[in-house]
Amino acid sequence: HTAAQDNCTCPTNKMTVCSPDGPGGRCQCRALGSGVAVDCSTLTSECLLLKARMSAPKNARTLVRPNEHALVDNDGLYDPDCDPEGRFKARQCNQTSVCWCVNSVGVRRTDKGDLSLRCDELVRTHHILIDLRHRPTAGAFNHSDLDAELRRLFRERYRLHPKFVAAVHYEQPTIQIELRQNTSQKAAGDVDIGDAAYYFERDVKGESLFQGRGGLDLRVRGEPLQVERTLIYYLDEIPPKFSMKR
């Protein structure tokens, strides 16, 4: 059970089943796919959300990377292994015993191998670049208004501490949101930048994970901001290990 479940729904994750089966008849919500009880006062980890979504259609993307170490989720959806707290396990394997190492946002960071592959630690993704293109508008958005609105969105909707939104860049029609969060900066209770980015990505695609809320209605000074393309780049604290340039 947790905060904000008193009517036995999970405001921050619609991909749950909730029932009043907790202490004193209080509500508990469990993620679909894994059955893991989730904390509905904050964002659910991306690993549990991916597990819940495992039957969804594959959504592979190939991107141009901003630097040689940036990772992109080219492998699309897979059914991940999560630890008891919902984080990605460092090593992921499929049904045919093909294994690979992932970072904290679940993106592959090594070549694929067999069951003997070792992934010593879950490497943290400390820098995420969200690259958006908005639909044409009458004129460019005011940069400072756009900056303020996006920071407000991450603070209020995704509960991400403002210090983790490093920058908002704008060159019409491209918007770039930089999220940075080192292991040493992330305190107990802080939303992970990877989870915030995933919720944002689903929001802009019209697939909101929030229970009962309308879709994302982003406005800058009353002018709708409609996103027509999203690319996300991930940078890890330790560079990935691939045998050749991809």
Partner: antibody, heavy 123, light 112 residues
Amino acid sequence: QVQLQQPGAELVKPGSSVKLSCKASGYTFTSYWMYWVKQRPGQGLEWIGEINPSNGRTNYNEKFKSKATLTVDKSSSTAYMQFSSLTSEDSAVYYCTREGHNYDGSLGAMDHWGQGTSVTVSS
Amino acid sequence: DVVVTQTPLSLPVSFGDQVSISCRSSQSLTNSYGNTFLSWYLHKPGQSPQLLLYGISNRFSGVPDRFSGSGSGTDFTLKINTIKPEDLGMYYCFQSTHQPYTFGGGTKLEIK
């Protein structure tokens, strides 16, 4: 690591009230219910009530409903219990304790405890 | 309110002994979803109580495997194998299935 910090002692006068604090650290304060437990000298443990730090929802033991008020300050990750109209019967050690989480199945159990605040009601 | 009765009140032991503490409730602690919220605590003098077992039989992290729990419905048992000096103190069972949550009266484990 999870810590619940409580002041060691409070000396208060009969008829007055006292507000006990419990500062939480090392975990997401709003994700775990907080319980308060009373222990009178040489006696057993009594459950006073619980509070959901995310929305302030409370459940009380009927016995303490008119005596105790539970609140939280999310900004400082602190839980409070105000005890009113104090009598000698209220002299006791008061513990704040965190309810476990469903991640590990310890829901409904008190997995971390403060050191307790000893309240002495005396004129 | 659910009344939780613990027996015995006092349990004199020698180191190395195996002992059992009983905990009985006035009504079933299993809710309509099949969950039983029954936990056990050890309270040593001058310390805060510490969680030993939750959900009847699950050991909390760091609790030695000489502690085990069993039971269902209204009858529960805590077993301690090979008593050690650090096991001495007051043992309490606690139910959080029904409001208000209630503790057993306690069992004092002391040296003979």
